[in-house]
Interface confidence: low
């Protein structure tokens, strides 16, 4: 089993990131850390999508990781998607700090993000909290900025 | 503007705690992560460990770790950093910085804690 | 945990000059590095983030390059306020680790 991924963040525009992932048991928290520049300032969607395929950009990645087939939601939801990692904020600078631990995603088994693609998204997600449809599906998060293939790090 | 304000000087004894407190200013409190380090006298610079202060997650350096506590307190937007049983060579000025992503890119002015008997 | 190596320890310089300062890892970083500049007395200031990137209200005199193992803090007119001790730092895995720091001097 692996214990430890990388994804590298890039768009067509400014926003490029590093993003490390981290689980020391198979069953533990995944602790997923890192930097994302070039953002406006606010919050961003952060979501796993279910390829690791970014041949046509970002769309290619498809939908949100969701294996158990549940509505979007926040990070801390009962109903959620794996691949629902709420937001990052970035500062006045473009920045975001990543500091998150997350125990639905994982690095191996069913919930296994390795392979699929990480992507930041151009508004907030409403965490599905947004009252139509698409706040079920997406979270409202609008386009995706950036994205990279989560893989095996050393 | 950001802004982190630390307590003031601090002189112990061998084998008793301190703890330095470290209040933010200017930005959104659990967005990002407080990292602590000290500066030795002639020394250079020494990351101790951080804290998230979303889910106070934290992870220290291991030389400190089993003798320091990092907290926070985000209804005053307060981080706080506890070393217990001091030596002589805890002698520092200690510095808290915003963490962000990979770097620390606002501190506290530090503070100076002398151990001496 | 992985060791920073910078060099030189010390440099003496002009106002004007150019100043290039280097930081070795032990290991592959990737692009997890920052300088700092410190004066005595004073907090350390963040220059560059992420190996490359300025970071905001710094000079566009500093610049940072590298990737992986090696890595250079430029800056390419020295000026009088410039003078201080720099320092990297590495970020790609706990703990984070400075280099030693390389002490800037008025020649």
């Known amino acids: 089993m692996a214990t430890k991924a990388v994804c590298v963040l890039k768009g067509d525009g400014p926003v490029q990131g590093i993003i490390n992932f981290e689980q020391k048991e198979s069953n533990g928290p995944v602790k997923v850390w890192g930097s994302i520049k070039g953002l406006t300032e606010g919050l961003h969607g952060f979501h796993v999508h279910e390829f690791g395929d970014n041949t046509a950009g970002c769309t290619s990645a498809g939908p949100h990781f969701n294996p158990l087939s549940r509505k979007h939601g926040g990070p801390k939801d009962e109903e959620r998607h794996v691949g629902d990692l709420g937001n990052v904020t970035a500062d006045k600078d473009g920045v975001a700090d990543v500091s998150i631990e997350d125990s639905v995603i994982s690095l191996s088994g069913d919930h296994c993000i390795i392979g699929r693609t990480l992507v930041v998204h151009e508004k907030a997600d409403d965490l599905g909290k947004g009252g139509n449809e698409e706040s079920t599906k997406t979270g409202n998060a609008g386009s995706r900025l950036a994205c990279g293939v989560i893989g095996i790090a050393q | 503007q950001v802004q982190l304000v630390q307590s003031g000087a601090e002189v112990k004894k061998p084998g008793a705690s301190v703890k330095v407190s470290c209040k933010a200013s200017g930005y959104t409190f659990t967005s990002f992560g407080i990292s602590w380090v000290r500066q030795a006298p002639g020394q250079g610079l020494e990351w101790m460990g951080w804290?998230?202060?979303?889910?106070?997650?934290?992870n220290y350096a291991q030389k400190f770790q089993g003798r320091v506590t990092m907290t926070t307190d985000t209804s005053t937007s307060t981080a706080y950093m506890e070393l217990r049983s001091l030596r002589s060579d805890d002698t520092a000025v200690y510095y808290c910085?915003?963490?962000?992503?990979?770097?620390?890119?606002?501190w506290g002015q530090g503070t100076l804690v002398t151990v001496s008997s | 945990d992985i060791q920073m190596t910078q060099s030189p320890s010390s440099v003496s310089a002009s106002v004007g000059d150019r100043v290039t300062i280097t930081c070795r890892a032990s290991?592959?970083?990737?692009?997890?590095l920052a300088w700092y500049q410190h004066k005595p007395g004073k907090a350390p200031k963040l220059l560059i983030y992420?190996?490359?990137s300025l970071q905001s209200g710094v000079p566009s005199r500093f610049s940072g390059s590298g990737s992986g193992t090696d890595f250079t803090l430029t800056i390419s007119s020295l000026q009088p306020e410039d003078f201080a001790t720099y320092y990297c730092q590495q970020a790609n895995s706990f703990p984070w680790t400075f280099g030693q720091g390389t002490k800037v001097e008025i020649k």
């Open positions: 804290i998230s202060v979303y889910n106070d997650y934290t």
């Open positions: 992420l190996a490359s």
């Open positions: 290991q592959d970083i990737s692009s997890w």
């Open positions: 910085a915003r963490k962000r992503g990979g770097d620390m890119d606002y």
